[in-house]
């Protein structure tokens, strides 16, 4: 879903621009918000469907959504819910299934209207060990050529890390990917509790920094109803 | 150092017009993402729109969809809000900002008071 | 108006701590790791202090620390100064709209 997060931060290999140099580990996947991953998860079916406690739909798979299991029920009690497919009720993006957003309060399919449309250059993604891959998706938002001559700084917009100065990757924020610090010790950053659970988010951080891994916060270990956020942690 | 200057601002009268520009130094313009951001005599902050870093792209609050138009130039390194159809409740500060990693940079704002 | 929850005022004497909280709905805040605080002395522009939960800029004290968890976000201050005292804004994105929001506030005082 559009909450969904890439594997393990692995922000990887993305294609040049015609004649550009290719991106090195470390680039962005991008596209539109709500322009979802349409291949390689096979949904879950209600029969083998486990409950699983969450307090954001980050922690849950790409065919999930966190909410309460009940109408009305106890906020703090939260579960990771299948999907709901095309002119189902939603609130949000995360709720619709793959290739499907939320529009006024109805899952609709996201190829109805090229949504959010603006993403020329096409992009294959290689996830972490998973080698899926992501279906192109055509940008309109072109980048100055002035990026090409000059790395980018922090907040300035990119294709790829290499378009990023050192320390920097390109990751998406909002509406484009722009050069985001890499993570230092202690900063949050995205881990997903399923291999194979990524898909494309609107707020990408970077990887973790040398030497540091993304691991859940020590602290929310014991809570039950904790956000489960995952810190950049020494080895 | 990053530099952002708005200008424009003003007493205008409902039903009328006004453009704000923004001139900004400092740094490379036209890689950056640039917003609108008001804020009305002594309330909170409000988010008005936002200009891709090439001009093709555009979002705006739905409170002033239909009414604004933010456009940018990136050859004079300048931001622009054209604001038609004034209401008394577009009284505000309007702070130009450099939508970075988030609003990293703003300028001092323009004072727009809609009033007959 | 679709906007984050914050106390209208908190306060606090120098050297103390204090969180102020911002409060969203799953659709914003709740939905996204991802918050951002400002804050803004009289007169003066917006100054971002906190991005994605708990990441400062650089030249922003690490008195200012940021965190999150469901629904809510908390900004904290630490060893708390005269120079703190000025309003604080959370924001974040609300998917419906697909906008930027802020909160709606919160006067810090430093007592004394």
């Known amino acids: 879903t559009l909450n969904s997060v890439l594997n393990s931060n692995a922000i990887k290999n993305l294609p040049p621009p015609l004649g550009g140099a290719a991106g090195h580990p470390g680039s962005a996947v991008s596209a539109a918000p709500g322009i979802l991953y349409p291949g390689g998860n096979k949904y879950q079916t209600i029969d083998n469907y486990q409950p699983y406690p969450c307090a954001e739909d980050e922690e849950c798979g790409t065919d999930e959504y966190c909410a309460s299991p009940t109408r009305g029920g106890d906020a703090g009690v939260q579960i990771c819910l299948a999907c709901r497919k095309r002119r189902k009720r939603c609130m949000r993006h995360a709720m619709c299934c793959p290739g499907n957003y939320c529009k006024n309060g109805i899952c609709v399919s996201s190829d109805q209207n090229n949504f959010r449309g603006e993403i020329e250059e096409t992009i294959t993604e290689s996830f972490g060990n998973d080698h899926s891959t992501l279906d192109g998706y055509s940008r309109r938002t072109t980048l100055s050529s002035k990026m090409y001559h000059s790395k980018g700084q922090e907040g300035s917009v990119c294709l790829r890390s290499s378009d990023c100065a050192t320390g920097l990757c390109c990751a998406r924020h909002f509406w484009s990917k722009i050069c985001k610090p890499v993570l230092k010790e202690g900063q949050v950053c995205t881990k997903h509790r399923r291999k194979g659970s990524h898909g494309l988010e609107i707020f990408q951080r970077c990887y973790c920094g040398e030497g540091l891994s993304c691991r859940i916060q020590k602290d929310h270990h014991q809570a039950s109803n904790s956000s489960r956020l995952h810190t950049c942690q020494r080895h | 150092q990053v530099q952002l200057v708005e200008s424009g601002g003003g007493l205008v009268q409902p039903g009328g017009s006004l453009r704000l520009s923004c001139a900004a130094s400092g740094f490379t313009f036209s890689s950056y993402w640039m917003s609108w951001v008001r804020q009305a005599p002594g309330k909170g902050l409000e988010w008005v729109s936002v200009?891709?870093?090439?001009?093709?792209?555009?979002y705006y609050a739905d409170s002033v969809k239909g009414r604004f138009t933010i456009s940018r130039d990136n050859s004079k390194n300048t931001l622009y809000l054209q604001m038609n159809s004034l209401r008394a409740e577009d009284t505000a500060v309007y702070y130009c900002?450099?939508?970075?990693?988030?609003?990293?940079?703003w300028g001092q704002g323009t004072l727009v008071t809609v009033s007959s | 108006d679709i906007a984050l929850t914050q106390p209208a005022s908190v306060s606090g004497s120098p050297g103390q701590s204090i969180t102020i909280s911002c409060t969203g709905t799953s659709s914003d805040l709740g939905g996204y790791n991802y918050v951002s605080w400002y804050q803004q002395h009289p007169g003066k522009a917006p100054k971002l202090m906190i991005y994605d939960v708990n990441n400062r800029p650089s030249g922003v004290s690490n008195r200012f620390s940021g965190s999150k968890s469901g629904n809510t976000a908390s900004l904290t201050i630490s060893g708390l100064q005269a120079e703190d005292e000025a309003d604080y804004y959370c924001q974040s994105y609300d998917s419906p709209t697909d906008s930027v929001v802020f909160g709606g506030g919160t006067k810090l005082t430093v007592l004394g």
């Open positions: 200009i891709s870093s090439d001009s093709s792209s555009t």
């Open positions: 900002a450099r939508h970075g990693i988030d609003f990293d940079h």
